[in-house]
């Protein structure tokens, strides 16, 4: 079998949901010494980057300016060390937002409910679309999908304090082209008096994977690695 290098990690910097005409940035984290990185879009080569100096950088950023529906879709990346290529990264779905109109999000029975109550979100958009998406802020990868002509419902079932948070919805014209986001709806879930104090509020931190963790190896890092290697040999 043909030898390959380990697959790189592909990430979107800040978010994978990019408003139209704005810039998307994708990071491909491979390995120190990689002389070339390639970004592929829907199976075709999209862009190339050659880090300088290759031995000091473990990844690259690919910039996609002027986002539109032609650039929305599935991206992956590979890298090369010498003549040896890596396996392909996992696929990353890049979505263009702020297309066409703005949906309206509502919640029944209301935004303030008690733990255990059944809650349903309704997303309405009058222009032609059949797929609707509901996202919780800070959990943008957990997309719920629902279908309907002009309105879709998202039954949450009996809620707990873990459902607390801010929600938005989108209408979707295809998997990668979404409408403007709705205004946020904040769901407040109160529990029993004993439980309420213990229930953690859901943090709305940005998604942890939406960060580029590329590092530039310094001379000091190299010296420390060499020192560590020498120390290990002495201990043996």
């Amino acid at each position: 079998p043909k030898q390959t290098l380990p697959k790189p990690i592909i990430r979107a910097e800040s978010t994978y949901m990019v408003p139209k005409e704005k810039q998307a940035t994708l990071c491909c984290q491979g390995s120190y010494g990689a002389v070339e990185y390639q970004l592929h879009f829907e199976g075709s080569l999209f862009a190339v980057e050659r880090p300088k100096p290759p031995e000091r950088i473990n990844g690259v950023k690919f910039h996609i300016p002027d986002m539109n529906s032609r650039k929305a879709g599935r991206y992956s990346c590979i890298y090369r060390v010498g003549e040896l290529w890596s396996e392909r990264s996992d696929l990353l779905d890049l979505v263009v937002t702020e297309m066409y109109d703005t949906p309206t999000l509502s919640v029944h029975p209301g935004p303030e409910v008690t733990s255990g109550e059944k809650v349903t979100f309704y997303c309405r958009l009058d222009t032609a679309t059949s797929m609707f998406l509901l996202l919780k802020e800070g959990r943008s990868r957990d997309v719920q999908r629902s279908y309907g002509k002009v309105q879709a419902e998202f039954p949450m079932g009996p809620v707990t304090t873990a459902h607390r948070g801010s929600y938005r919805c989108f209408g979707s014209y295809n998997n990668y082209a979404w409408s403007f986001p709705s205004e946020p709806v904040k769901l407040l879930v109160t529990g029993d008096i004993e439980n309420t104090s213990l229930a953690p509020t859901d943090p709305t931190f940005p998604d942890s994977w939406d960060t580029c963790l590329l590092t530039r190896e310094t001379g000091l890092q190299k010296d420390l690695a060499l020192w560590d290697h020498t120390a290990q040999n002495l201990l043996r």
């Epitope: 910039h63 996609i64 032609r70």
Partner: nanobody
Framework: EVQLVESGGGEVQPGGSLRLSCAAS????????MGWFRQAPGKEREFVAA???????YYAESVKGRFTISRDNAKNTVYLQMSSLRAEDTAVYYC????????????????????WGQGTLVTVKP
Amino acid sequence: EVQLVESGGGEVQPGGSLRLSCAASGRTFASAAMGWFRQAPGKEREFVAAISRSDDTYYAESVKGRFTISRDNAKNTVYLQMSSLRAEDTAVYYCAAVVPTYGSNIYVHSAAYNYWGQGTLVTVKP
């Protein structure tokens, strides 16, 4: 708004050379990544060569070693030097730009480019 105007096309014999030029208007040229594409009659537009804002280059396999892309930021112009031309190089050649860009990405996919020229015809025949 960026405008791109190609020139330098014409008729040449197999084995001959041509240099295409693409003049860009606007002050954003130095921050633009540039590329050349071509479209032969009855075929799809295909990538030929590209250059990043930091002068890194990438070529289609079919032209590697025969074509050279370069840029002159002072003149707001990108060039395609074509040598050892073959009949299969006959096509309309288009210049394209990605504006703005950051870093030194070289763009290969036509969807990446947001500005295009009108094209210049290159005909290779005996």
